[in-house]
């Protein structure tokens, strides 16, 4: 089992859309998938959860954060739009 985050480090303009890529390879047909982030102050935050049928984000994600779970591509991408300066962090995909 493995997770691959293909996106390089990204510097994007405030107000734009960013898609953080995550693909997974597992024998499980319905894995639990997660996004977490570590902010510049080293705080660790849960961002999003999803499986084949639903997804749920932390309170701060409402309105601007979403996930795109592309089952045909075994992908669980995190979409931030519009992105803000306070979104700066290192984002991790896991399952």
């Amino acid at each position: 089992d493995k997770v691959t985050q293909s996106s390089p480090d990204q510097t994007v303009a405030s107000g734009s859309e960013v898609v953080l890529l995550c693909t997974y390879d597992t024998v499980y047909s319905n894995p639990d998938l997660f996004w977490y982030r570590i902010r510049p102050d080293y705080s660790f935050q849960f961002v999003f959860y999803g499986d084949n049928s639903r997804s749920e984000g932390a309170d701060f994600t409402q309105g601007r954060f979403s996930v795109k779970h592309i089952l045909t591509q075994k992908a669980f991408h995190l979409v931030i739009s519009p992105v803000r300066t306070e979104d700066s962090a290192t984002y991790y995909c896991a399952f």
């Epitope: 996106s7 390089p8 795109k68 592309i70 045909t72």
Partner: antibody, heavy 115, light 107 residues
Amino acid sequence: EVQLQQSGAELVKPGASVKLSCTASGFNIRDTYMHWVKQRPEQGLEWIGRIDPANGNTKYDPKFRGKATITADTSSNTAYLQLSSLTSEGTAVYYCSEGIYFDYWGQGTTLTVSS
Amino acid sequence: DILLTQSPAILSVSPGERVSFSCRASQNIGTIIHWYQQRANGSPRLLIKYASESISGIPSRFSGSGSGTDFTLSINSVESEDIADYYCQQSNSWPYTFGGGTKLEIK
């Protein structure tokens, strides 16, 4: 089985508009992105734009903005490409595809713009 | 926009030879590049995703490499059925772009 079925060939006059369709089976378009790609005769591939059918959010190559409009109907699992004010430059094969990378493609719709 | 430059425009090789297609990006795109094959009168077909990841159902003779700005698609032993146009495509930033393509001919 995943399939993308596109509408049939079109012959339209210069200045007219046309709406092409792409119906997906084997997956729900809400869960992915739907793209349109143009290929003029004997030319390469050009990305027109994409839609996120879950929310209607679209992205276009600037050269197609104002000429192309991408929409989606999740109830029929279909994406559409509307082309307006067509000229001979619009004569091409138009493909739909899905995802971040394009692992599934429609068979293409041939559009001919001629008087 | 990210410009993808493919070279050469035409490659002519003999069956059984190894062939490499080049794709150069105008700026760093990490490994967010994909390769497609398009045979005459057909729809494109995905060969390689994310620069080097293989695709189920694609013959193992196809491989990809590279990161940053320089990428390569290789066919380690060309067969006659490989006659086609080959395109690279980036999905790192908007707008998505394709390279101009390389036509593979068999001698």
